[in-house]
């Protein structure tokens, strides 16, 4: 399992992970106490046949070629959580591990 | 966590799971002894904003709107394995659980 890493200067057209810092303050999400911002990353790029395919299933669907099936798309294939401190809407403040907040790897599925 | 289920008669345009039987014999994959065919399913349809989003991350990237980020796409969000009996290319026959062969749920990520 591997994936490409790119930055804003990359000329890579294929499916790649790009850096992105999410700033909760800029969104006006004041119920989030911490972190104020975090490195979320995102996936972008083309999925040519077989390149970075995560599942054998993707290959099989391509072979079977059913009506309406799009080609694979560049999407997170590995994600990780972050710890957040936030108001839960019931006048309580909660510290919790929020899953799937950071993209660690991108692939075609 | 839920996803839509459709069939070939559905008029649903949104991200949906469709039935698909993969026929190894039709592919000419004669190294697979069993099963000869299985219900793989596939994902197809549109991902309007927020509909069936698997990850909070998807929403955050949409908010941050970085250069080159495509909208979310309809992709498997839950998959399951099947047991297969196959030649492994070293004159051995293997019985094994092959992961991510069946789409159980589709979503936007």
């Amino acid at each position: 399992d591997f994936g490409l890493d790119c930055d804003e200067h990359s000329t890579e057209s294929r499916c790649c992970r790009y850096p992105l810092t999410v700033d909760f303050e800029a969104f006006g999400w004041d119920w989030i106490i911490a972190p104020k911002r975090y490195k979320a990353n995102y996936c972008s790029g083309e999925c040519e046949f077989v390149f970075l395919q995560k599942y054998p299933h993707t290959h099989l669907v391509h072979q079977a070629n059913p009506r309406g099936s799009a080609g694979p798309c560049c999407t997170p294939t590995k994600m990780s959580p972050i710890n957040m401190l936030y108001f839960n809407g019931k006048e309580q403040i909660i510290y919790g591990k929020i899953p799937a907040m950071v993209v660690d790897r991108c692939g075609c599925s | 966590d839920f996803g839509l289920d459709c069939d070939e008669h559905s008029t649903e345009s949104r991200c949906c799971r469709y039935p698909l039987t993969v026929d190894f014999e039709a592919f000419g994959w004669d190294w697979i002894i069993a099963p000869k065919r299985y219900k793989a399913n596939y994902c197809s349809g549109e991902c309007e904003f927020v509909f069936l989003q698997k990850y909070p991350h998807t929403h955050l990237v949409h908010q941050a709107n970085p250069r080159g980020s495509a909208g979310p796409c309809c992709t498997p969000t839950k998959m399951s394995p099947i047991n297969m009996l196959y030649f492994n290319g070293k004159e051995q026959i293997i019985y094994g659980k092959i992961p991510a062969m069946v789409v159980d749920r589709c979503g936007c990520s």
Partner: antibody, heavy 116, light 107 residues
Framework: EVQLLESGGGLVQPGGSLRLSCAAS????????MSWVRQAPGKGLEWVST????????SYPDSVKGRFTISRDNSKNTLYLQMNSLRAEDTAVYYC?????????WGQGTLVTVSS | DIQMTQSPSSLSASVGDRVTITCKAS??????VAWYQQKPGKAPKLLIY???SLQSGVPSRFSGSGSGTDFTLTISSLQPEDFATYYC?????????FGGGTKVEIK
């Protein structure tokens, strides 16, 4: 340099009211949640209240809920604690604190004495 | 409410000693524990948050560890300025609660 300066403490009779202020400088006040914590003489620390950066969300322990109100004026870089129906057990030094995962900067405190 | 039980309540130590203070939560608080230092007549100062993250500007002789219900603050080599009272706090869910404090005195 982060600075927090509490004021408004003093002697008040049981059942009375008091409003504490906390003037903040050295950081972008409107970006951070803020908290109040108190310490009775010779005792440990007790959390009193927290308010979100924009002022939309607040939280209190049962011991002060309904009697104390936390608020903020981001245009004045000031945090407030309105204390009503004061009791002898509210006697303490009251600290304001800048809130992150934990309270990462504290003021020097203001003493509130509730006594007849 | 989550109770935080700190031990010992006081200890005597010498400059250069390794000092360990423990804090036990009444229920699982993940890694949501902070440690503060307070000197007489002064405001508390944050040392550690999220169980093991060192607050900016705090000397590296301070370290925190633990998860779940058992947490430790360690001072690897006690300095003269470290004689103070130390408090743990859970920031897992409100009402946030503090331990009773540990007074570190000169032997």
């Amino acid at each position: 340099e982060v600075q927090l300066l509490e004021s408004g403490g003093g002697l008040v009779q049981p059942g009375g009211s008091l409003r504490l202020s906390c003037a903040a400088s050295g950081f972008t006040f409107s970006s951070y949640a803020m908290s109040w914590v108190r310490q009775a003489p010779g005792k440990g620390l007790e959390w009193v209240s927290t308010i979100s950066s924009g002022g939309s969300y607040t939280s209190y322990p049962d011991s002060v809920k309904g009697r104390f109100t936390i608020s903020r004026d981001n245009s004045k870089n000031t945090l407030y604690l309105q204390m009503n129906s004061l009791r002898a057990e509210d006697t303490a030094v009251y600290y304001c604190a800048k809130q992150d995962y934990a309270m990462n900067y504290w003021g020097q405190g203001t003493l509130v004495t509730v006594s007849s | 409410d989550i109770q935080m039980t700190q031990s010992p309540s006081s200890l005597s130590a010498s400059v250069g000693d390794r000092v360990t203070i423990t804090c036990k939560a009444s229920q699982d608080v993940s890694t949501a524990v902070a440690w503060y230092q307070q000197k007489p007549g002064k405001a508390p100062k944050l040392l550690i948050y999220a169980a093991s993250s060192l607050q900016s500007g705090v000397p590296s002789r301070f370290s925190g560890s633990g998860s779940g219900t058992d947490f430790t603050l360690t001072i690897s080599s006690l300095q003269p300025e470290d004689f103070a009272t130390y408090y743990c706090q859970q920031h897992y869910s409100t009402p946030w609660t503090f331990g009773g404090g540990t007074k570190v005195e000169i032997k």
